[in-house]
Amino acid sequence: QDPWAAEPRAACGPSSCYALFPRRRTFLEAWRACRELGGDLATPRTPEEAQRVDSLVGAGPASRLLWIGLQRQARQCQLQRPLRGFTWTTGDQDTAFTNWAQPASGGPCPAQRCVALEASGEHRWLEGSCTLAVDGYLCQFGFEGACPALQDEAGQAGPAVYTTPFHLVSTEFEWLPFGSVAAVQCQAGRGASLLCVKQPEGGVGWSRAGPLCLGTGCSPDNGGCEHECVEEVDGHVSCRCTEGFRLAADGRSCEDPCAQAPCEQQCEPGGPQGYSCHCRLGFRPAEDDPHRCVDTDECQIAGVCQQMCVNYVGGFECYCSEGHELEADGISCSPAGAMGAQASQDLGDELLDDGEDEEDEDEAWKAFNGGWTEMPGILWMEPTQPPDFALAYRPSFPEDREPQIPYPEPTWPPPLSAPRVPYHSSVLSVTRPVVVSATHPTLPSAHQPPVIPATHPALSRDHQIPVIAANYPDLPSAYQPGILSVSHSAQPPAHQPPMISTKYPELFPAHQSPMFPDTRVAGTQTTTHLPGIPPNHAPLVTTLGAQLPPQAPDALVLRTQATQLPIIPTAQPSLTTTSRSPVSPAHQISVPAATQPAALPTLLPSQSPTNQTSPISPTHPHSKAPQIPREDGPSPKLALWLPSPAPTAAPTALGEAGLAEHSQRDDRWL
């Protein structure tokens, strides 16, 4: 086998590493793989970065291609721009370097495209189908600092072997990112292990200074020390632990402060307490107790779904109004009948991490298909056309030529169409005020891929997020989601919100699917009451109609252990949407930071007419939404910006850590 295709390799500088993974993957799979390791697909924006990529890739075969982090949605050509309408997967279009194989050709750009780099020659950039599994991919990892490679010593048995935080093992590094481990073997038979750690005086450095292969005081057997052995001047040895561990009572072994599981989700050694807690993707630390994690309500983030959104613990799902069906991406809606009948099957296949077990996964996915249950309809406001992602650059329009989005009048009530992906009824024992904005804006229609979660410990049954059996064919049936389908009731004339009070019987036996809510409509506000909710079921909640003034709407507090649902008034901050001149963003959305308890499923109409003010559940501030790998979707009409009130706020609602188990919906890019 060609050495080019054998093992992953990396090249690191003082603040970032590029890594080449010669594994055949689609763009989506490659992007996920980089994210799983804590990085992103490579974004070589400068000639210097491109040079590092060139030296890493070397002279490969002409037939080999490697994904980099550039993607363009259908009909998004901007041929006069350096990136031609392509956007880095980090969400922007800033670049000081391009390496296109051909000059831009004027064309309609009808399809989504991704960029691969030729492994041979000048490593030119080629565009092509994102669903093609090319020969490999380039990841980029940024970090706070790096340690220089260790100098070889006279007593060494061989070069130091380095292991990076992204699991690459090599002797060929010039710089080692923070968190790397260096293993040095000495001729005397013993060795030393060093960690690239933060130094008390600032910066990073190796956990131990050289020389590493001198003296015999700690020899043999490392002086009985589990981690580091230190030879004192008087000849005796003392033991030390590497960063993140503390010396145990015996003075020799080292303890992991995270072993006592002080954190609800993820624990990282270090910090003043000896550890720090982190939350998985879809969750954030509770403000009153950073050890705990609360659900992030992705449905409150501008444009998660093209039309309607349901939030649940650790994830969300998208829904479509009557006459529309959810596309295979699980995000976009298309007029009914426009998609193939296999769409839900397609998604299961499309989002597989690898091609290895496709047949098994297909079978598991098909097992869902007989499980649909028709139910009475839910009242909905007709959603409107979605705007596009924010870009770093925005073309100027004269004041009178600001692009406008046509907003159709809300139709009351457009019923909900059936979700294409099984609705999961995992255990939820959380509360959240449920408030829906009628002016909630949306990211563009698109096929947005999931974020693959990082490695994490298995959760107890009570903490598991939804699992789609297509990705886990071997799950016992008890863990497989129930499936909910909705058919609509007759619509009254448009613009006349009906007065309705309807009781629905208990349609689902326990351990199958959530109870269907009893919905009462008063004016334009809908509050939802659930009949008996069996334990371990996540109820589906519908809230709010169109054109609501600022108010303190009713909030639902739902506990799956309880069958009575108190309705608690909660003051909510308002969301103001206003049109601006081209100099400032087209839509400014003020989203104050606030504590949110973990969410039950919340159905949101994604969007409604502009220039209205209505309540929205608070969420923490966001900077510009990152661009995400997506499948093809209709052309968006307008860019959307989210302000960043707090400069230190996390850029996305989805953290860097992963989810316990991912479903078809729980790990979408936002």
Partner: antibody, heavy 124, light 108 residues
């Protein structure tokens, strides 16, 4: 210009083996993957497998796995496809085809050049 | 495996006609679709790659469109030399190529 020239027709008995050749010219042989495609009379085209002459990397269609072997001789710029344990349903025209790498700045895996085909008849 | 279904299987048309052939995939294949023309006793010839890109030297009367699961090949004005069999091919799960069953275009 790019050409793929295949060996002549073969008549074989059931249970026998056949080895077809595909000689490439007009381009750098190791820069492009070679695929083999079967077309039985009145049937659709069926992909059998490929080889990357750069590193002899091969992948086969599960349907033919165990019976088909694809090899190359880079010095002769030639690809070979050997099919064993022949049966009557193996009677078909077999094509070698080159996988394109890029066209006008696009990468794509369609098959841009094909050999003229070799008819293999399996009959007792 | 991804299945490709072409329609119609047979098509009679006259010179100058506009003809459309459809190819449906059993699951999303993005734009990883090509169209080939094959004449009796000859090898297939590449017409369209990546769903909508015309291959070098292919006349402009041939065009391709679609993405996801539905694709079309259109011949805007049939010429005598266009009567042949047309195949669609997907390669999204490369290297596992699959082909449609073919559409035979005959002179009316």
């Amino acid at each position: 210009q790019v050409q793929l020239v295949q060996s002549g027709p073969e008549v074989k008995k059931p249970g026998a083996s056949v080895k077809l050749s595909c000689k490439a010219s007009g381009y750098t042989f190791t820069d492009y993957v070679i695929h083999w495609v079967k077309q039985a009379p009145g049937q659709r085209l069926e992909w059998m497998g490929y080889i990357n002459p750069y590193d002899d990397d091969t992948t086969y269609n599960q349907k033919f796995k165990g019976r088909v072997t694809i090899t190359v001789d880079t010095s002769a710029s030639t690809a070979y496809m050997e099919l064993n344990s022949l049966r009557s349903e193996d009677t078909a025209v077999y094509y070698c085809a080159r996988r394109g790498n890029s066209y006008d700045g696009y990468f794509d895996y369609s098959m841009d050049y094909w050999g003229q085909g070799t008819l293999v008849t399996v009959s007792s | 495996d991804i299945q490709l279904t072409q329609s119609p299987s047979f098509l009679s048309a006259s010179v100058g006609d506009r003809v459309t052939i459809t190819c449906r995939a059993s699951q999303n294949v993005g734009t990883a679709v090509a169209w080939y023309q094959q004449k009796p006793g000859k090898a297939p010839k590449l017409l369209i790659y990546s769903a909508s890109n015309r291959y070098t030297g292919v006349p402009s009367r041939f065009s391709g469109s679609g993405s996801g699961t539905e694709f079309t090949l259109t011949i805007s004005s049939l010429q005598p030399e266009d009567f042949a069999t047309y195949y669609c091919q997907q390669y999204t799960n490369y290297p596992m190529y699959t082909f449609g069953q073919g559409t035979k275009l005959e002179i009316k």
